[in-house]
C-alpha cells in the first residue's frame, strides 16, 4: 500500500515561513505577499515509528523533491540536514530511524521530535533568516512550535 | 537468553485495580519496546497496549481509560495496572516484547511471558 | 483500527495432511502479518513474520504467503505436536489486532 501523505506549509509560533537556503539547508523569515510561494511545500508521510497516544511517527520530504528532513550525528551532536534519497524508494511506510519525527500536538501547536534523538526537536531562531535546526531545549529562546497549512494536491 | 515474566495477584475483587509486573531478562527495557496482551478463558488474544523503550505508551482505545503502563528500567520491569476492574476483565495476562527493527520489522512480538491468570470475583 | 477475518474458526485433520489457514485484512497491511501457535496453557509462539518469513528454529513444513489484505498460512504435512490453535496479527500500525483463532483438532 502507498504511504499515506499530505502536503502542508509549517510556520513557527512567531509566523516565520520556512524556505530553501541553498540546496540543502532551510531558514526561517517572516514572508508576505506574493513572497509567501516562496515557502517549502513538505510532503509530510504517516509512517511506522514508536507512535504513541501523544506522537504520530511522521517523515518530511519536500514536495516533488527527493529531499527529506533527517537526523544525524555531526561532531557528535544531533544535527538537522536534508537527505538526498532514491526517489524510486521514497516515501515509504518503513521510513529509516534517523527520518522519522514524533509530530506533537499541544494547545494547536505541533512540536516535531527526533526519532533518532529523543528530546531534540525542529527548531527555529528567534532572528531572523537562521537556519532550521535541531535542538535540545524546549521552552527556551529558540522555537519549537509550529503550525501546519494544509496545501491541496 | 530472552525471557519475559509475569507476575501478580490471580484473585481481584470487583472495582479494584488489577496490578502486574512484567519481569524481563536478556534485553534491555531502554531499548525495546513492551506489550500487554490479554486472553478471557476459551477466548481470542486482545492486545492491550504497549510501552516503547523511551517511555511512550499506546493504549488501545477500549481499555484506555482505566489503563496505564509504566515501567523501571534498572529493575527491568514493565507494571500494567487497570483500574476499575469487572468480571469482563478475567483473562490470563501476557507481556511480549516488540521486535523493534527500525524500517523493517517495528511492531511484531518476538518473545512472550508465559502468562499469568487474574480472575475478578468477589 | 484494523479487523483481521480469521477462518476456519476450527479445523479437523490427521497426521500428514496438508493445512490451510487463511487471513484477511480490512486494508492493505503491506506484508506485515505475523502467524502464532498457541498449546493449551502455553504462551502463543511465532512463527513466520512479515507474511513469510520464518522465524528461527521453526520447522520448514509451516509456510506463509500473501500480501495487500490476503495471507494463508499452511501446514504441509501436519505432524502430532502441530495440534493448536493459530492466530494470525496485522503489525502494520496500531493497535495491533489478532485474527479470531483457528483450532486445528486432530481428526
Known amino acids: 500500500a502507498p504511504v499515506r501523505s499530505l502536503n502542508c506549509t509549517l510556520r513557527d509560533s512567531q509566523q516565520k515561513s520556512l524556505v530553501m537556503s541553498g540546496p540543502y539547508e532551510l531558514k526561517a523569515l517572516h514572508l508576505q505577499g506574493q513572497d509567501m510561494e516562496q515557502q517549502v511545500v513538505f510532503s509530510m508521510s504517516f509512517v511506522q515509528g514508536e507512535e504513541s497516544n501523544d506522537k504520530i511517527p511522521v517523515a518530511l520530504g519536500l514536495k516533488e523533491k527527493n529531499l527529506y528532513l533527517s537526523c544525524v550525528l555531526k561532531d557528535d551532536k544531533p544535527t538537522l540536514q536534508l537527505e538526498s534519497v532514491d526517489p524510486k524508494n521514497y516515501p515509504k511506510k518503513k521510513m529509516e530511524k534517523r527520518f522519522v519525527f514524533n509530530k506533537i500536538e499541544i494547545n494547536n501547536k505541533l512540536e516535531f521530535e527526533s526519532a533518532q534523538f529523543p528530546n531534540w526537536y525542529i527548531s527555529t531562531s528567534q532572528a531572523e533568516n537562521m537556519p532550521v535546526f535541531l535542538g535540545g531545549t524546549k521552552g527556551g529562546q529558540d522555537i519549537t512550535d509550529f503550525t501546519m497549512q494544509f496545501v491541496s494536491s | 537468553e530472552v525471557q519475559l515474566q509475569e507476575s501478580g495477584p490471580g484473585l481481584v475483587k470487583p472495582s479494584e485495580t488489577l496490578s502486574l509486573t512484567c519481569t524481563v531478562s536478556g534485553f534491555s527495557l531502554s531499548d525495546y519496546g513492551v506489550s500487554w496482551i490479554r486472553q478471557p478463558p476459551g477466548k481470542g488474544l486482545e492486545w492491550i497496549g504497549l510501552?516503547?523503550?523511551?517511555?511512550?505508551?499506546y493504549y488501545n482505545s477500549p481499555l484506555k481509560s482505566r489503563l496505564t503502563i509504566s515501567k523501571d528500567n534498572s529493575k527491568s520491569q514493565v507494571s500494567l495496572k487497570l483500574s476499575s476492574v469487572t468480571a469482563a476483565d478475567t483473562a490470563v495476562y501476557y507481556c511480549?516484547?516488540?521486535?523493534?527493527?527500525?524500517?523493517?520489522?517495528?511492531?511484531?512480538?518476538?518473545?512472550w511471558g508465559q502468562g499469568t491468570l487474574v480472575t475478578v470475583s468477589s | 483500527d484494523i479487523q483481521m477475518t480469521q477462518s476456519p474458526s476450527s479445523l479437523s485433520a490427521s497426521v500428514g495432511d496438508r493445512v490451510t489457514i487463511t487471513c484477511q485484512a480490512s486494508?492493505?497491511?503491506?506484508?506485515?502479518l505475523n502467524w502464532y501457535q498457541q498449546k493449551p496453557g502455553k504462551a502463543p509462539k511465532l512463527l513466520i513474520s512479515?507474511?513469510?518469513t520464518l522465524r528461527p528454529g521453526v520447522p520448514s513444513r509451516f509456510s506463509g504467503s500473501g500480501s495487500g489484505t490476503d495471507f494463508t498460512f499452511t501446514i504441509s504435512s501436519l505432524q502430532p505436536e502441530d495440534f493448536a490453535t493459530y492466530y494470525c496479527?496485522?503489525?502494520?500500525?496500531?493497535?495491533?489486532?489478532f485474527g479470531q483463532g483457528t483450532k486445528l483438532e486432530i481428526k
Open positions: 496479527l496485522q503489525s502494520d500500525r496500531l493497535p495491533l489486532t
Open positions: 512479515l507474511g513469510s
Open positions: 510501552i516503547w523503550g523511551g517511555g511512550d505508551t
Open positions: 486494508t492493505d497491511i503491506d506484508d506485515d
Open positions: 511480549a516484547r516488540q521486535t523493534n527493527l527500525w524500517a523493517y520489522d517495528l511492531y511484531s512480538m518476538d518473545y
